[in-house]
């Protein structure tokens, strides 16, 4: 007959594979969260494990669509982070919504070369309207 | 994840108050809303109304101003809801729910809900 | 307030049958600048919390996908395109259009 082939070894320190659950915000349905991993193995000594996840969202979702949000100008560039930030209050919340009452959020500040005057006046100009429309 | 652990049965007289509480694991809990419903036996569900952890803020159903008072102790991370003047009428499973997330007011997440029997 | 009135208080059937939960609301739950229905449905087993099924419309993750959610402004339906023994429970629809939130009285699903 045929030759079987030997089998592999397992070690008794064999662990199996991790398997891991989906990314649960830790807040909202989006961003930050947390995944636990489970794994088998009768001599494995780490069965279970939580890692960070991320699960992308843009801030309207983060936020709910039912949550309307005032929000300040932003702020200046982190240079450890590279984002900048800004704050928004909650304005008006539709249908009862559960909001929550004040929101962070930030985007990367892009190349921290000085703009030119005239671009930086128009931008201002710009960001100065757009602080007084309610932001969706 | 999210777990909300709610206090034992009580077993109180009529006329007297309760106080029950409902605390939360796994989340920002200083940032989202914690609504109490209210369910007789064998009746529908009744929304009481919710609390905002972060200052203290609340919305109640006019039906329960006056007898249901909510606040919240961040330190613990327990909202409590006091039930005063009790009568009959106030016999009822009590639940603390959450919504999954920010936006409309559907409750994702529930506590195992919380006995209350006025009783002579 | 707006009135949930759910029908019909109970009924029974036998496993793989299609079941119909009716929901009406006192007055319509779409908001037409978005397009969504505000009304849930949950399930509650005996002893039990309440469970998120649906809402507008949109399966909660984890839930089968025999439960199917419909409707739009004042008339909802919970189909169950084939009931099984574990669907043995009471259903409520919710409506979050405004405060108060209101509950129906639920529908009693028992199995012949």
């Known amino acids: 007959g045929k030759k079987e082939k030997p089998e592999k070894k397992v070690k008794k320190s064999d662990c199996g594979e991790w398997q891991w659950s989906v990314c649960v915000p830790t807040s909202g349905d989006c961003g930050l969260g947390t995944r636990e991993g489970t794994r088998t193995g009768a001599e494995c000594k780490q069965t279970m494990k939580t890692q960070r996840c991320k699960i992308p969202c843009n801030w309207k979702k983060q936020f709910g669509a039912e949550c309307k949000y005032q929000f300040q100008a932003w702020g200046e560039c982190d240079l450890n982070t590279a984002l900048k930030t800004r704050t928004g209050s909650l304005k008006r919340a539709l249908h009862n919504a559960e909001c929550q009452k004040t929101v962070t959020i930030s985007k990367p500040c892009g190349k921290l070369t000085k703009p030119k005057p005239q671009a930086e006046s128009k931008k201002k100009k710009k960001e100065g309207k757009k602080q007084e429309k309610m932001l969706d | 994840q999210v777990q909300l652990q709610q206090s034992g049965p009580e077993l109180v007289k009529p006329g007297a108050s309760v106080k029950i509480s409902c605390q939360a694991s796994g989340y920002a809990f200083s940032s989202h809303w914690m609504n109490w419903v209210k369910q007789r036996p064998g009746k529908g569900l009744e929304w009481i109304g919710r609390?905002?952890?972060?200052?203290?803020?609340?919305l109640y159903n006019g039906k329960f101003k006056g007898k249901a008072t909510l606040t919240a102790d961040k330190s613990s991370t327990t909202v409590y809801m006091q039930l005063s003047s009790l009568t009959s009428e106030d016999s009822a499973v009590y639940f603390c729910a959450r919504t999954r997330a920010y936006g409309p007011a559907w409750f994702a997440y529930w506590g195992q809900g919380t006995l209350v029997t006025v009783s002579a | 307030d707006i009135v949930m009135t759910q029908s019909p208080s109970s009924l029974a059937m036998s496993v793989g049958q299609k079941v119909t939960l009716s929901c009406r609301s006192s007055?319509?739950?779409?908001?037409?600048?978005?397009?969504?229905?505000?009304l849930a449905w949950y399930q509650q087993k005996p002893g039990q919390s309440p469970k998120l099924l649906v809402y507008a419309s949109i399966r909660e993750s984890g839930v089968p996908d025999r439960f199917i959610g419909s409707g739009s402004g004042t008339d909802f339906t919970l189909t169950i395109t084939s009931v099984q023994a574990e669907d043995l429970a009471d259903y409520f629809c919710?409506?979050?259009?405004?405060?108060?939130?209101?509950f129906g009285a639920g529908t009693k699903l028992e199995l012949k």
């Open positions: 609390i905002y952890p972060g200052d203290g803020d609340s």
């Open positions: 007055q319509s739950l779409l908001d037409s600048n978005n397009q969504k229905n505000y």
């Open positions: 919710q409506q979050h259009y405004s405060t108060p939130l209101t």
